[in-house]
Structure formats: C-alpha cells, structure tokens
C-alpha cells in the first residue's frame, strides 16, 4: 500500500493566441495550482478538445463569463 | 477597428501562380482568424480556406488542397494567399475576411470584416 | 461537404414590401449560420450572425431565424438602398460553404 495516492496535475505551459468562437466553446476549468508555471484557463470545445487559454486576454475572460451565464440559465 | 488591405490587381498567365497580400491594422494578424474567399465573375462567393484557432492550423477547401497556400508574416501583420498551377477558371475577385474584434459580437464567429478584394485574371 | 441550398433564386420586390429568403443545409448546422448582403463591385458585408444576432450598425428591418437546417432572412420593409445580392453562410463544418445567393431587384 502506498502512503499517499498521487494525483496527477494538469498545466498549461503554451496558450492559444486567437479567439475561438464561443459556439465551440462548452466549458472551462481554471488552473490555479502553484505548481504550474502559468495561471490558466482549458476551455473544453464542443469537439471534445482541451486548449489552453490566458486568463488576462480580454476573449478568454468574456468567454467565462459568457458560458458562466449558460449554465447560470440551465439551472431550474 | 481592424481594417484589411489587400495588393492590387493581377494578370497571369495559365499555369502561372499568384500571391495575394492583406495587410491588417488596428489589431495584430496573430489575434485574428483569417479566411479567403473568392467570387468569379457574375458567380457565387466560395470559401477557400482559413486559420482554425481550435486546432491551431489552416484548413483548406477540398478544391484547392495541393494548389493553394496561406500564410502569415506576423512581423508586417500581413497575411498571405498563394494559388498556383492557375486556369481560366480561377479569373476571380479574392477577399480576405476576419473577425472584428472590438465589436458586442466579437466573441462569434467572424469574418464580419473584409478587405476590398483583389481582381485576379487568368488568360494566355 | 455540406451543400447550402437558398430560395428564391432572385425576385423581383418593391420599395416597402416585405421580403424572405430561405436557406436551407443538407445537414444540422445548429445555429452557426450568417447572412452577408453584397452589391456590385463591393465586398459583402455580414448582416446577421448567430441565425438571428443583428450586427451591430445594420437596421433593424433585417431579421434572422431558424435552426438546424432550415434558416430564413426577413427584410421587413425594403428600402432603396436593399437591393442587393444576400448570401448564407454555414460556419458549422469544414468546409464553410454559402449558399448561392439571392438576387433582389425593383419590381
């Protein structure tokens, strides 16, 4: 038995420069973690891929928010 | 605003080959997606090809697959269409066309700005 | 490929009447459609994104609907200054594909 189970981390070493339309786009997960190098954002599109994103361009943050407000809206 | 200008008009010979410029402003060429779309006279507009940010490389219409090239300077933000081996067919007025990325809508799917266009003329 | 079939072809319409053209996809494209009106000499410019988002500076008389694969522009109340070619254009799957435009000219 180990002692501790390890959990892989996910981290963004390279983002995307341009914009992706926000019809793509059906999530997003912000890395945080202090073991990464960047503070990021992994839209996942509605083709199942994973891409990485900076947080302080202007598209990544109006993307959140835009998909903040869907879900905000599918709730009951 | 971005703003889009493309070289101006070519003539060519058949089996020759022509390259296309459209320069951008008010944004750099990195930020944007950029598309070529092309209308032969009295005909239809045709999408060509364009950036996909998703996967991060050009795609290419079928059609003109082995025959066309797009590419970008990003030092000049200029963005480049090379079509060669061309025909009569390929007589043409052709666009470059991107997103508008300060605009309530930008986060859409663009080409919502386009250049003037540039006349291409194939004949022997 | 998908193939964008629009309808009518051209017609003929007066200054004040109300004008539809449909497009319509030979598969799903959800609702990643627009309508570009271009004129003579001059480069098309996108009127509707979205099916029925209004870009920003185009009047309020054009209108966007629809979903899936059938998708419809309404001029409300044409004006002069409308008569024009308007395309569609699926941005769904590559390729993108237009349809074949609709001519509007003065009846």
């Known amino acids: 038995q180990p002692d501790s189970v390890s959990i892989p981390i996910t981290c963004c070493f390279n983002v995307i420069n341009r914009k992706i339309p926000i019809q793509r786009l059906e999530s997003y997960t912000r890395i945080t973690n202090i073991q990464c190098p960047k503070e990021a954002v992994i839209f996942k599109t509605k083709r199942g891929k994973e891409v990485c994103a900076d947080p302080k361009e202007r598209w990544v943050r109006d993307s959140m928010k835009h998909l903040d407000q869907i879900f905000q809206n599918l709730k009951p | 605003q971005v703003q889009l200008v493309q070289s101006g008009a070519e003539v060519k010979k058949p089996g020759a080959s022509v390259k296309v410029s459209c320069k951008v402003s008010g944004y750099t060429l990195t930020e944007l997606s950029m598309h070529w779309v092309r209308q032969a006279p009295g005909k239809g507009l045709e999408w060509m090809g364009g950036?996909?940010?998703?996967?991060?490389?050009?795609i290419y219409a079928q059609k003109f697959q082995g025959r066309v090239m797009m590419t970008e300077d990003t030092s000049t933000d200029t963005a480049f269409m090379d079509l060669s081996s061309l025909r009569s067919e390929d007589t043409a007025v052709y666009y470059c066309?991107?997103?508008?990325?300060?605009?309530?809508?930008?986060?859409?799917?663009?080409?919502?700005?386009w250049g003037q266009g540039t006349t291409v003329t194939v004949s022997s | 490929d998908i193939q964008m079939t629009q309808s009518p072809s051209s017609l003929s319409a007066s200054v004040g009447d109300r004008v539809t053209i449909t497009c319509r996809a030979s598969?799903?494209?959800?609702?990643?459609l627009g309508w570009y009106q271009q004129k003579p000499g001059k480069a098309p410019k996108r009127l509707i994104y979205?099916?029925?988002s209004l870009q920003s500076g185009v009047p309020s008389r054009f209108s966007g609907s629809g979903s899936g694969t059938e998708f419809t522009l309404t001029i409300s109340s044409l004006q002069p200054e409308d008569f024009a070619t308007y395309y569609c254009l699926q941005h769904n799957t590559y390729p993108f594909t237009f349809g074949p435009g609709t001519k509007v000219d003065i009846k």
């Open positions: 066309a991107t997103d508008d990325m300060l605009t309530p809508h930008y986060l859409y799917f663009g080409m919502d700005v």
């Open positions: 598969q799903g494209i959800r609702n990643d």
């Open positions: 979205a099916t029925s």
């Open positions: 950036f996909d940010p998703e996967d991060g490389e050009t």
